[in-house]
């Protein structure tokens, strides 16, 4: 978990502090908030990024209808507990001893309870649907060009293996990107779809997590793709457990 950049910075995570006291005097970068060393050759986990953020001085229609079990992150920012590998702990609690269970992307998947609440396992989010609305353009984007550009973005900028970008749907002005990654599919070293989606979300909001890079400049055949709204749905391998009160609200 060290970075060996000449100028001792972390290209994939600006929420770090780097110093030349790693093994052999090499550059080592640590996430703010947790103090954990991070691997600057890949994306940092969403849990460590959220922790750093909280510590630093939100007809056959081609569009997908999110499942009834899809979760949206309505709770906003919180200071999460991360496990030794930087993943979200299954149970999260706030300072007032209110606790809840989260999935692998840190989104609440149960009602809130007290300290007696049990979260037996971290449930994996295996399907993420990123729903974007782009600003008006002279005409619609060519679907295959748009598809190719978004796949390239996830492959090159976020280092996500192309096989995890399941589909790109387009019905002007709505774009949907489907990311799928089962536990069995994710090999050691593979970027997690939850981390890639979080980096993308921050890029779209103009809050890039990359060090020193310009913001995201998305273009399709030279035409700027400017996003005006983003909604992300998370589907877990095991459906969430909310009370009927919430479901009917």
């Amino acid at each position: 978990h060290t970075a060996a950049q000449d100028n001792c910075t972390c290209p994939t995570n600006k929420m770090t502090v780097c110093s030349p006291d790693g093994p052999g005097g090499r550059c080592q970068c640590r996430a703010l908030g947790s103090g954990m060393a991070v691997d600057c050759s890949t994306l940092t986990s969403k849990c460590l990024l959220l922790k750093a953020r909280m510590s630093a001085p939100k007809n056959a229609r081609t569009l997908v209808r999110p499942s009834e079990h899809a979760l949206v992150d309505n709770d906003g920012l919180y200071d999460p507990d991360c496990d030794p590998e930087g993943r979200f702990k299954a149970r999260q609690c706030n300072q007032t001893s209110v606790c809840w269970c989260v999935n692998s992307v840190g989104v609440r998947r149960t009602d809130k309870g007290d300290l007696s609440l049990r979260c037996d396992e971290l449930v994996r989010t295996h399907h993420i649907l990123i729903d974007l609305r782009h600003r008006p353009t002279a005409g619609a984007f060519n679907h295959s060009d748009l598809d190719a550009e978004l796949r390239r973005l996830f492959r090159e900028r976020y280092r996500l293996h192309p096989k995890f970008v399941a589909a790109v749907h387009y019905e002007q002005p709505t774009i949907q990107i489907e990311l799928r990654q089962n536990t069995s599919q994710k090999a050691a070293g593979d970027v997690d779809i939850g981390d890639a989606a979080y980096y993308f979300e921050r890029d779209i909001k103009g809050e890039s997590l990359f060090q020193g890079r310009g913001g995201l400049d998305l273009r399709v055949r030279g035409e700027p793709l400017q996003v005006e709204r983003t909604l992300i749905y998370y589907l877990d391998e095991i459906p969430p457990k909310f009370s009927m009160k919430r479901l009917t609200a």
């Epitope: 978990h1 060290t2 001792c8 502090v17 110093s19 030349p20 006291d21 790693g22 093994p23 080592q28 640590r30 703010l32 947790s34 103090g35 954990m36 060393a37 691997d39 001085p57 030794p84």
Partner: antibody
Amino acid sequence: QVQLVQSGAEVKKPGASVKVSCKASGYTFTNYWIGWVRQAPGQGLEWIGDIYPGGGYTNYNEKFKGRATLTADTSASTAYMELSSLRSEDTAVYYCARGTGGGDYWGQGTLVTVSS
Amino acid sequence: DIVLTQSPDSLAVSLGERATINCRASQSVSTSSYSYMHWYQQKPGQPPKLLIKYASNLESGVPDRFSGSGSGTDFTLTISSLQAEDVAVYYCQHSWEIPYTFGGGTKLEIK
């Protein structure tokens, strides 16, 4: 050569505050974390927290949060550790060290005695 | 917090003999690349002195009779041939996550 020189011994009353300084020389002060560790008489080492002078970033051991304050004056290449609401159990030698963990250079230590 | 348990608490070894000190972490402090465990020597009235960094990297100026090994949760500091000047208390420390805790120390004496 790298050196960390700490301020002299202090005697304080319970409830008071103490501020220990650590002057660094021989390296670029803003490039390395400065950690603070204490050692009660006859006891082991206890990590208080650390500060990155280059950006003022700090980490604290939860046990000391709210009582310990780490600061740094980059113009003077000096780090400070202030501990408030002192009690007798805070009697210890306080050390500064260069590095996040695996501190390679240490100050000589500052004895802080808390006694009424 | 990660708890580091050192064993034994104290150790008496004859001059020229091998001394072995263990440190067990309550959770893994290693990645596939590095182990975030360090070893210090402290003599009475002196600050700790770094001996081994990242489990096995000998600090410059430290005699090569000192060596470190281990990964995951179990780490060892070995002195291959004990010298009189090695009498001291030895501490392990991790730097995996905040807080960077220390082990309780092992007092090494001459038998």
